[in-house]
C-alpha cells in the first residue's frame, strides 16, 4: 500500500532570466527512493539515480544544474519555460509517486513564490 | 551525421597498459556522456564505465574500478580509456559509445578495437 | 546486480516470419530497457529505448513492449537483414547489465 505523500513547492514564480529551484520531498513512507525524474509536461529534463548519479537530457545541459539534493535548478530562464514540471519518484517497494509544480516566468520583477501545498 | 571512431587493434604483454581512444564527430560533444562496453571473444556484452564530458565525473561499474580509467579532451572531443594490469581474460574488443537522450543506454557506437594481451 | 535473462537463447526462423525474444530482469526496473541488435564483426545498433521507443532509423517492424520484470522484442516480418544476435540491457542501476544474447538464425 503506498502511503506517502510528495509535498512540492507549489505554484511558483521568477522572472525571466532568471534561476528557480524545483524542488519535491517524498513523506510519510519508508519507501526507498531508487530514481527521481523531472520532467517538462511530457519533455524529460534530468533523472537522478541513487545508483548512476544525474543524467541531464542533453538538450537541456546548458540551462539545468542538478540539486539541490533531489531537486533541479534551472537557470537562465526564458517565458516558454512557463508550465507544469512533474518530479516522478521511483521506490521500493511503493512504486512511483508524482508531483506536480506550476511555474511562471515573468517579464517583470513581481516574481514571488507561491504557498507549498501538498499532491496525495 | 553522428560518429565514433575508435584507435587500431592493440596487441600487448601481461602487466602492460593500454589506452583507446575514440573520435567524436557531428553532435556537441560535452553534451552527452559516453560509455565503455567490452565484448571478449564469443560473449555477450559488459559496460565498463561511463564519463560526462561537460564536467568529466566517471561512473564505473565496481568491477572494472581500478582497471579502467576515463578521460576526455574536449578540445578535440575525444575520449580515452585506459586499461592496467592487463591480463589474458582483458583480451575482449572495446567499444565507445554515444550516450542516449533519455538516459543511461547507448546510441550510437564506435567500431570497436580489439586488445589482445598475450605473453 | 540486476541480472537480465534473455530467451531463446537461439531461434531458426524464415524470411517473414514474426519473431518474439524475452527478457526477464530480476527485479523491477520500470521501462528502463533498451533492445540492440548485432552482426558478426560489427558494433551493436540501438533498436529500442525506455522498453518501446524507436530511434530514428529503425524499421518500424521492429517494436518492443512490456515494464517491470517482463519485456519483449518483436520483428513483425524477418527481413534477410535482421538475422543477427539480439542484446537487451537496463538502464536502471549500477551495474548497467546486458542480456546473454539471442542469435536469429536462418531456418
Known amino acids: 500500500m503506498m502511503t506517502g505523500t510528495i509535498e512540492t513547492t507549489g505554484n511558483i514564480s521568477a522572472e525571466k532570466g532568471g534561476s528557480i529551484i524545483l524542488q519535491c520531498h517524498l513523506s510519510s513512507t519508508t519507501a526507498q527512493v531508487t530514481q527521481v525524474n523531472w520532467e517538462q509536461q511530457d519533455q524529460l529534463l534530468a533523472i537522478c539515480n541513487a545508483d548512476l548519479g544525474w543524467h541531464i537530457s542533453p538538450s537541456f545541459k546548458d540551462r539545468v544544474a542538478p540539486g539541490p539534493g533531489l531537486g533541479l535548478t534551472l537557470q537562465s530562464l526564458t517565458v516558454n519555460d512557463t508550465g507544469e514540471y512533474f518530479c516522478i519518484y521511483h521506490t521500493y517497494p511503493d512504486g512511483t509517486y508524482t508531483g506536480r509544480i506550476f511555474l511562471e516566468v515573468l517579464e517583470s520583477s513581481v516574481a514571488e513564490h507561491g504557498a507549498r501545498f501538498q499532491i496525495p | 551525421q553522428v560518429q565514433l571512431v575508435q584507435s587500431g587493434a592493440e596487441v600487448k604483454k601481461p602487466g602492460a597498459s593500454v589506452k583507446v581512444s575514440c573520435k567524436a564527430s557531428?553532435?556537441?560533444?560535452?553534451?552527452?556522456?559516453m560509455y565503455w562496453v567490452r565484448q571478449a571473444p564469443g560473449q555477450g556484452l559488459e559496460w565498463i564505465a561511463f564519463?560526462?564530458?561537460?564536467?568529466?565525473?566517471?561512473t564505473y561499474n565496481q568491477r572494472f574500478r581500478g582497471k579502467a580509467t576515463l578521460t576526455v579532451d574536449t578540445s578535440i572531443s575525444t575520449a580515452y580509456m585506459e586499461l592496467s594490469r592487463l591480463r589474458s581474460d582483458d583480451t575482449a574488443v572495446y567499444y565507445c559509445a554515444r550516450g542516449g537522450d533519455y538516459g543511461w543506454y547507448l546510441g550510437v557506437w564506435g567500431q570497436g578495437t580489439l586488445v589482445t594481451v598475450s605473453s | 546486480d540486476i541480472q537480465m535473462t534473455q530467451s531463446p537463447s537461439s531461434l531458426s526462423a524464415s524470411v517473414g516470419d514474426r519473431v518474439t525474444i524475452t527478457c526477464r530482469p530480476s527485479?523491477?526496473?520500470?521501462?528502463?530497457l533498451s533492445w540492440y541488435q548485432q552482426k558478426p564483426g560489427k558494433a551493436p545498433k540501438l533498436l529500442i529505448y525506455?522498453?518501446?521507443s524507436l530511434p530514428s532509423g529503425v524499421p518500424s517492424r521492429f517494436s518492443g513492449s512490456g515494464s517491470g520484470t517482463d519485456f519483449t522484442l518483436t520483428i513483425s516480418s524477418l527481413q534477410p537483414e535482421d538475422f543477427a544476435t539480439y542484446y537487451c540491457?537496463?538502464?536502471?542501476?549500477?551495474?548497467?547489465?546486458f542480456g546473454q544474447g539471442t542469435k536469429v538464425e536462418i531456418k
Open positions: 564519463i560526462d564530458p561537460y564536467n568529466g565525473g566517471s
Open positions: 557531428g553532435y556537441a560533444f560535452s553534451r552527452y556522456s
Open positions: 540491457q537496463h538502464h536502471y542501476g549500477n551495474p548497467l547489465t
Open positions: 525506455n522498453a518501446k
Open positions: 527485479e523491477n526496473i520500470y521501462t528502463y
